[in-house]
């Protein structure tokens, strides 16, 4: 649900702060980065949309990327821009809208939303359909014909959650984003009430699974409100969650 996407990501093992902008209510991943928010402009009207400053693509919504608003503009002044549709020019995968990736400077359709298709295509061009190996170690010859037709498994690099198999989401790990398991009932999550207060986060948990939301654990009382343990819990039928 929207609420669980908003609230259920937890980060740990932080390195020393490295800077970064504050969270953006419309972003897929916060500027920290680490907290998933509802995706991009689709929850905002054009009238109230305001350019959001960013440093990296993942600080923007799923339908946005981070760049200077003017061609050849100051790289220090970047904002979240609308993603580019098929056949539009691009420089990296995140510039292309979901379901596409950047190949040879143009946004092209991904196979099964697999945004790394460029690598597999390179292999097909180089080796054709011959999947034999010379010494058992010509590892690039079979750069995963199976991966090309399936979504990312646990630990696979991803750009968006749609790149991952069912039950997984795309979340930050170190300096990349990988497919990780969606949280199950009882698993720890972190509910960030104040956006932009979480510092730089490089280990990110998925959101809570279907029918679950990130809520404070009952009978877990601590002096500090901010340090209370949150877990993925079943929705109460009589209880509804709303955004603030």
């Amino acid at each position: 649900t929207l609420n669980s996407v908003l609230n259920s990501n937890a980060i740990k093992n932080l390195p020393p702060p490295l800077g970064g902008a504050a969270g953006h209510p419309g972003s897929a991943v916060s500027a920290a980065p680490g907290i998933l928010y509802p995706g991009g402009n689709k929850y905002q009207t054009i009238d109230n949309y305001q350019p959001y400053p960013c440093a990296e693509d993942e600080e923007c919504g799923t339908d946005e990327y981070c760049a200077s608003p003017t061609r050849g503009g100051d790289a220090g002044v970047q904002i979240c821009l609308a993603c580019r549709k098929r056949r539009k020019r691009c420089m990296r995968h995140a510039m292309c809208c979901p379901g596409n990736y950047c190949k040879n400077g143009i946004c092209v359709s991904s196979d099964q939303n697999h945004f790394r298709g460029e690598i597999e295509e390179t292999i097909t061009e180089s080796f054709g359909n011959d999947h034999s190996t010379l010494d058992g170690y010509s590892r690039r010859t079979t750069l995963s014909s199976k991966m090309y037709h399936t979504k990312g498994q646990e630990g696979s690099v991803c750009l968006r959650s749609s790149d991952c198999a069912s039950g997984l989401c795309c979340a930050r790990h170190f300096w990349s984003k990988i497919c990780k398991p969606v949280l199950k009932e009882g698993q720890v999550c972190t509910k960030h009430r104040r956006k932009g207060s979480h510092g730089l986060e490089i280990f990110q948990r998925c959101y809570c699974g279907e029918g679950l939301s990130c809520r404070i654990q009952k009978d877990h009382h601590q002096a500090s409100n901010s340090s209370r343990l949150h877990t993925c819990q079943r929705h109460h039928h009589h209880h509804h969650h709303h955004h603030h």
Partner: antibody
């Protein structure tokens, strides 16, 4: 074909500086994080620095303040500026990236840095 | 930081034999439902090559004779039947925490 080619290694005196380069090809360079990993003669592997696709940088304490990792996405190039070099920085320096999974799944062949007087 | 200890330091075996390499972490490398343990092979004068990631998943194009297992702090790399090209040094690496760290290596040599 994915390729990473390092250059810039050489002999330098303690306290000196050196700039390593890594030329990447065969993938959309600007979309991926990339790292430097080193290996001292006869020793194991040690992570040196990483930079995300968006340019955020990460270092271990052993090189923080002395080494600077950077990237030029327009040139498909990665750099490592090494200052205040010490004898213990002597190693083969590899650039490595993570294209398919979170591990270092593609490596260059390395460039040798020797710090000696 | 997480310290990885590999054993044995050297393993002397003949082609066709089974090799079992061990890696022990100073603390659990499991998180987010994944064991963040990787294995690499390195031959003299060459760069490391990824064999196994997430404890048991094979890297691209890696022969089926290489398999990984384990969780928490104890991990194993198994080569079911050694080929002549398998004699090399093998490193484990954890990616649960910054800094990512490597084990000291196990050399698999011809008996």
């Amino acid at each position: 074909e994915v390729q990473l080619v390092e250059s810039g290694g050489g002999l330098v005196q303690p306290g000196g500086s050196l700039r390593l380069s890594c030329a990447a090809s065969g993938f959309t360079f600007s979309s991926y994080a990339i790292s430097w990993v080193r290996q001292a003669p006869g020793k194991g592997l040690e992570w040196v620095a990483s930079v995300s696709g968006g340019g955020r940088t990460y270092y271990p304490d052993s090189v923080k303040g002395r080494f600077t990792i950077s990237r030029d996405n327009a040139k498909n190039s990665l750099y490592l500026q090494m200052n205040s070099l010490r004898a213990e920085d002597t190693a083969v320096y590899y650039c490595a990236t993570s294209l398919e999974n979170y591990a270092f799944d593609y490596w260059g062949q390395g460039t040798t840095v020797t710090v000696s007087s | 930081e997480i310290v990885l200890t590999q054993s044995p330091a050297t393993l002397s075996l003949s082609p066709g034999e089974r090799a079992t390499l061990s890696c022990r972490a100073s603390e659990s490398v499991d998180d987010f439902g994944i064991s963040f343990m990787n294995w690499y092979q390195q031959k003299p004068g060459q760069a490391p090559r990824l064999l196994i990631y997430a404890a048991s998943k094979q890297g691209s194009g890696i022969p089926a004779r290489f398999s990984g297992s384990g969780s928490g702090t104890d991990f194993t790399l198994t080569i079911s039947s050694l080929e002549p090209e398998d004699f090399a040094v093998y490193y484990c690496q954890q990616a649960k925490e910054v800094p990512p760290t490597f084990g000291g290596g196990t050399k698999v040599e011809i008996k």
